[in-house]
Interface confidence: low
């Protein structure tokens, strides 16, 4: 016996956040892994008085303690609809079915005399049917439904008389069913029987407050189990050759502070006082845990030496229950001020360390949904995925000997103190219906798939490819708004006077009269900020730099009456100095920021983008920028993520759609101006960049979720792409969806109607497609009332906790970018596409492994889109150059300009132009590489500052 469970809270120093196997493991379970599903008799059988069944303590408790619950009589009626249960088991394809025998159905008053024939026949029929189907039965003798007569006559489990009566009942079951049953469970979760039955009074028989009674009941349950194990071991195992255990349930807990000894001690005490209470005598040294003996000496019964010897080792495997009954209600748990956690993997590790690596059957696992959820139990899929992933990790990575898994539960049924307010079944049952059809929920489909594949196959992504991006590919880095320096920071050559320093006297500078020195003209390098930018860019080894101008700085009044020439000079310097390093600029004219939308103050006060005149002001501003910088800048973005301004103009859907309309017009006016006035001489390209995350259905088994995923793309991307890239009008699907909600009185929103002139203005006003892509969202349909953009979509998002995610909960889902690129091409034709921002926040200040992982994986998928899908991908701009103070850490550099290790990783990808085969040449011809820059430098020299 090892007893070293507390070591589990000393975290593994080798844990790496980007080894996805530590978050989710794509692998299979061991061959012959035992897949099953379970039910409890009282929860699903119904027929509580039918065919001679006696009342149980729960039947009585329901009538006396649970208001608004008539009985378990409705339930799922498994006693009547046995065939329907068998069909459900067939559908899922389990290897075993764990069910419990109702003690009062066999022996109405609990005493073993002549069994109730109908009850005997029911269980016999069930067992025969399971054997016929090759489904192994795992039979629980006691799942809380003690015959009421034993409670009333003896006081139930408080009285040790029950031990022998229970043994008689077990003996009868072994005799009658043992030929067909190889796995027996004596008692299901004795902790809850004792704690809630006699401590909190939340379970039958509903006694509470007497701590001595709680521990007496626990004591008797352990002795009853031990007696039955010895009975089976001596009299039945030799010829029946089965195994017997007791299902022990527990929560899991994490320390508030992982390095704090006291917190770890509290966590150990918490586990010991729940799981250890029963596991220590049975799986450990035969006695209660030392901590409990010390703390509860006045109420905890004592095992004699002989009894300890008798208790020890009375289980052939460790049957473990990990589900909501051990977690809720939380106030009844031994939280001890620490943090309750659903980390099944760690709980299994604790059992391994504490009880010397036993073979483990997960005898109950699952979560619950609200009773209103019918067959689309999306969250249940993710809970199951998370739990199963943790079990697989425990087996494959921690070498824990889990041999089977019981999903809980086969059917919706009676859920103890929660009665019918929650559902735990993989099959939905309408309790008010006559026929009680078993309808498979999404979780049933999911579990069926898991069993069929014996685990998780990696279907989402294809293997990595080797290959390179084209020579003219833009390798970029994106920065948000650059605030111009108002004055050059180095005036040392602008003062013509000579000074002498009075070093020994008053230590002041004294001007030398009559001497005038030559000054030198202002230079770009006088701007300290620009030097910093260039140093960072040089280290990035990028070919392109995307940054945004500050409209409010360039035109403080919002019109051309007051142009800030110094700001324009600053921006011109950024571009020209970059060109000297061989780095071309992609310039964003307008990059809205939440604080004040980045608009000049007068425009902001005149209703901002709700005012159509802002679009005309933007056109004038764009024209100024094209004129002043267009000789050097060949790639322009008019507006960054106009589709995200809905976050700000969100008072109503009509505000959102109105602002979006004016943003579209602003972009189109700017593009038309460039096309007409500047393109002939400057030969640049203009577009706008859209926030373009991919969307997947949260529940792949629900049609409504597939529709919601497409609707997300329509509302998020097509909303702007359709009018500009394709038709000049909003997407028909989006217009119709909003109109339909309007007709049903669920929203008063409406998309603006476009005139023919507006459609002509908008259509075709992009030279390339620019997408900002960060993650993939998992979406589900949920009908939402209200007249805002968010509710018009009828979409909710789900966070998949098994996915690798950043501190701001951006999920790392590389294959989403490839799907996005294919969707764009399919919908809008074969055009040049730039990914104008893509990145992740990473807490690390030096070794930002998450960012390196993200870049490598996402660029792999972009390369697949280029090589395999033939998408015309022209550039990838990593987001972002430097992080901002107190903001999520997206930068390659810290806010005080310290470089992170992802820079070298990105350098390597850039110099290799992707992921080439070994020994393949990654060189491009010199002319190809430098043509643009030679021309640029020539222009730089010709144009005065």
């Amino acid at each position: 016996f090892s007893g070293d469970g507390r070591a589990i809270w000393s975290k593994n120093p080798n844990f790496t956040p980007v080894n996805e196997s530590q978050l989710f493991l794509y692998d299979t379970f061991p061959k012959n892994f035992f897949w099953g599903i379970g039910t409890g008799a009282l929860q699903v059988e119904g027929s509580w008085k039918k065919d001679g069944k006696g009342p149980s303590i729960w039947d009585h408790f329901i009538h006396t303690h649970l208001k608004n619950v008539s009985s378990t009589n409705g339930s799922s009626d498994s006693y009547i609809f046995l065939e329907k249960d068998l069909s459900a088991l067939d559908f899922i394809g389990v290897s075993f079915y764990q069910f419990s025998i109702s003690w009062p159905r066999l022996f109405p008053d609990g005493i073993v005399t002549v069994a109730n024939a109908k009850g005997l026949q029911y269980y016999s029929t069930l067992l025969d049917a399971l054997v016929l189907r090759n489904i192994e039965p795992i039979v629980t003798l006691y799942h809380w439904d003690l015959p009421l007569a034993l409670q009333e006559k003896y006081g139930g489990w408080k009285n040790d008389t029950i031990i022998d009566i229970f043994n008689d009942y077990a003996t009868y079951c072994f005799q009658m069913f043992g030929d067909r049953v190889k796995y027996w469970i004596t008692i299901h979760n004795p902790y809850l029987v004792a704690w809630h039955g006699y401590g909190t009074g939340m379970h039958a028989p509903g006694e509470k407050g007497n701590l001595a009674a709680v521990y007496t009941v626990g004591h008797n349950l352990i002795k009853a189990h031990s007696k039955v194990w010895h009975n089976y071991n001596t009299h039945f195992r030799p010829h029946q050759k089965g195994w017997l255990s007791i299902t022990l349930g527990s929560h899991w807990i994490e320390p508030n502070r992982s390095e704090n000894t006291m917190d770890i001690f509290k966590c150990q005490q918490s586990m010991v006082s729940v799981l250890g209470w029963f596991a220590n005598p049975i799986h450990g040294d035969g006695d209660y845990p030392e901590g409990m003996r010390k703390k509860l000496f006045s109420v905890l019964p004592i095992f004699s030496e002989a009894e300890k010897h008798e208790m020890r080792g009375t289980a052939d495997f460790f049957a473990f229950s990990f589900g909501p009954n051990n977690f809720k209600p939380l106030n009844t748990m031994a939280k001890m001020g620490q943090n309750v956690s659903l980390n099944l993997r760690e709980a299994l590790n604790w059992i391994k360390l504490e009880y010397n690596n036993p073979r483990i059957l997960i005898a109950e696992n699952g979560w619950f949904t609200d009773s209103r959820v019918k067959t689309e139990d999306t969250t249940a899929i993710y809970m199951m995925k998370n739990f199963l992933s943790q079990v697989l990790q425990a087996i494959r990575l921690d070498e824990i000997r889990v041999f089977g898994y019981t999903a809980w539960s086969l059917l919706d049924g009676f859920e103890w103190q929660d009665a019918y307010t929650i559902r735990r079944g993989l099959f939905y049952v309408d309790f008010n219906s006559k026929q009680k059809e078993r309808k498979p929920k999404s979780s049933a489909h999911y579990y069926k798939q898991i069993i069929r594949e014996n685990g998780f196959s990696l279907k989402e992504s294809t293997p990595d490819v080797q290959g390179q991006f084209p020579c003219d590919f833009s390798w970029g880095v994106t920065e948000s708004v650059l605030k111009p320096e108002s004055v050059a920071s180095s005036p040392q050559f602008s003062d013509p006077h000579l000074y002498v320093w009075n070093a020994t006297g008053n230590r002041l500078l004294h001007r030398v009269e009559g001497v005038r020195l030559k000054t030198r003209p202002a230079q770009c390098t006088d701007f300290v900020n620009i030097k910093k930018q260039l140093e960072m860019l040089a280290r990035m080894k990028v070919t392109h730099y995307r940054f945004a101008l500050d409209w409010a700085s360039v035109l403080p009044t919002g019109n051309l009456s007051a142009v800030n020439r110094q700001a324009l000079r600053y921006y011109r310097c950024v571009v020209s100095e970059g060109l000297k390093l061989g780095i071309s600029a992609m310039v964003t004219l307008y990059y809205p920021t939440h604080a004040h939308l980045g608009l000049p103050e007068p425009l902001l006060h005149a209703d901002g983008w709700l005012n159509p005149s802002t679009a005309e002001a933007f056109q004038a501003y764009a024209g100024l920028c094209f004129q002043e910088l267009g000789d050097l800048v060949k790639l322009w973005i008019t507006i960054n993520e106009p589709n995200r301004l809905s976050d700000i103009y969100n008072r109503s859907g009509n505000d959102t759609y109105g602002a979006a309309h004016n943003l579209l017009v602003a972009h189109a006016l700017a593009w038309r101006l460039y096309d007409r006035q500047f393109r002939p001489s400057q030969r640049g390209a203009v577009s706008l960049s859209l926030h373009a995350d991919w969307a997947e259905p949260a529940n792949p088994y629900a049609d409504s979720h597939w529709r919601a995923a497409e609707r997300f793309l329509q509302f998020e991307i097509a909303w702007f792409a359709e009018p500009l890239f394709k038709t000049g009008d909003y997407p028909a699907a989006m217009r119709e969806y909003i109109a339909s909600k309007h007709r049903r009185g669920l929203s008063s929103s409406a998309l603006p109607r476009l005139t023919e002139a507006e459609r002509r203005l908008l259509k075709g006003t992009v030279d390339f497609c620019a997408l900002n892509h960060f993650t993939t969202r998992f979406v589900m349909h949920e009908q939402l009332a209200g007249s805002r953009y968010d509710s018009d979509r009828d979409i909710q998002f789900l966070q998949d906790i098994t996915r690798l995610s950043s501190p701001t909960r951006l999920a790392v889902i590389p294959w989403g970018v490839r799907k996005l690129l294919r969707w764009v091409r399919r919908n809008y034709g074969d055009m040049d596409i730039y990914i104008t921002a893509s990145g992740i926040d990473d807490q690390a200040l030096e070794d930002d492994r998450l960012r390196k992982y993200y870049l490598g994986k996402y660029l792999q998928e972009v390369l697949k889109a280029y090589l395999i899908d033939k998408v015309r991908i022209k550039g990838y701009y990593a987001f972002k150059l430097a992080e901002e103070k107190s903001k999520p850490r997206f930068g390659f550099f810290t806010s005080d300009f310290k470089a992170k290790s992802s820079i070298q990783f990105y350098n390597k990808v850039i110099s290799s132009r992707g992921f080439p085969f070994e020994n393949s040449s990654s060189r491009c011809s010199q002319t190809q590489e430098n043509t643009e820059c030679t021309v640029c430098l020539f222009l730089v020299q010709k144009k005065p500052l």
């Epitope: 508030n256 502070r257 917190d263 509290k266 005490q269 918490s270 703390k295 209600p329 939380l330 106030n331 031994a334 939280k335 001890m336 001020g337 620490q338 943090n339 309750v340």
Partner: antibody, heavy 124, light 109 residues
Framework: QVTLKESGPVLVKPTETLTLTCTVS??????????VSWIRQPPGKALEWLAH???????SYSTSLKSRLTISKDTSKSQVVLIMTNMDPVDTATYYC????????????????WGQGTTVTVSS | SYVLTQPPSVSVAPGQTARITCGGA??????VHWYQQKPGQAPVLVVY???DRPSGIPERFSGSNSGNTATLTISRVEAGDEADYYC???????????FGGGTKLTVLG
């Protein structure tokens, strides 16, 4: 019967130091399950926790006031003392001490007995 | 640091049920305590550890806690229940006591 009683000056000048005493009876400050907190309430405002002292003499302070507070206890006198430096008119409030119970030696179960409070005005 | 959010006021007619909420990130995994404070008096603990009642507190006071919300429920409200109610947790991460901003319960009529 368990009681707690706060005592201290009614009026304090700005920049001065406030010393408050909480005298307890009916339980021992040595008891492993007992701790004492100080809480204040400016007129018409919400309760604000200041500091806590555990039975093993561990101390915990409100982050925003940590630099100005010191909590200590004298078990023999059954007293818990709170010292607050550099007083300011915004510190005008009713100051309470309250007993906290820790059940089973592990988890904190709220403040089950409070003193009646002492009102402190900070004014020049 | 941990923040608890309470509605500033709740009104209820005598004999009806009052529900006062206390929001906090994953508050369900914390133990929540509730205090009643009448004008000019010290606070009184009415519910501790989410749903337990100290002796002397009527059964009409009950509590629940799950997800991001804890709730104090007062059934069959009486005029004498009019008071300010505060929720409180022990933030184990910082070893700090945290109070909610308080809710004024007004009994109408």
């Amino acid at each position: 019967q368990v009681t707690l009683k706060e005592s201290g000056p009614v009026l304090v000048k700005p920049t001065e130091t406030l010393t408050l005493t909480c005298t307890v009876s009916g339980f021992s400050l040595n008891n492993a399950r007992m701790g004492v907190s100080w809480i204040r309430q400016p007129p018409g405002k919400a309760l604000e926790w200041l500091a806590h002292i555990f039975s093993n003499d561990e101390k915990s302070y409100s982050t925003s006031l940590k630099s100005r507070l010191t909590i200590s206890k004298d078990t023999s006198k059954s007293q818990v003392v709170l010292i607050m430096t550099n007083m300011d008119p915004v510190d005008t409030a009713t100051y309470y001490c309250a007993r906290s119970v820790v059940t089973g030696g592990y988890y904190y179960d709220g403040m089950d007995v409070w003193g009646q409070g002492t009102t402190v005005t900070v004014s020049s | 640091s941990y923040v608890l959010t309470q509605p500033p006021s709740v009104s209820v007619a005598p004999g009806q049920t009052a529900r006062i909420t206390c929001g906090g990130a994953n508050i369900g995994s914390e133990s929540v305590h509730w205090y009643q404070q009448k004008p000019g008096q010290a606070p009184v603990l009415v519910v501790y550890d989410d749903s337990d009642r100290p002796s002397g507190i009527p059964e009409r006071f009950s509590g629940s806690n799950s997800g991001n919300t804890a709730t104090l429920t007062i059934s069959r409200v009486e005029a004498g229940d009019e008071a300010d109610y505060y929720c409180q947790v022990w933030d184990g991460n910082s070893d700090h006591v945290v109070f909610g901003g308080g809710t004024k319960l007004t009994v109408l009529g």
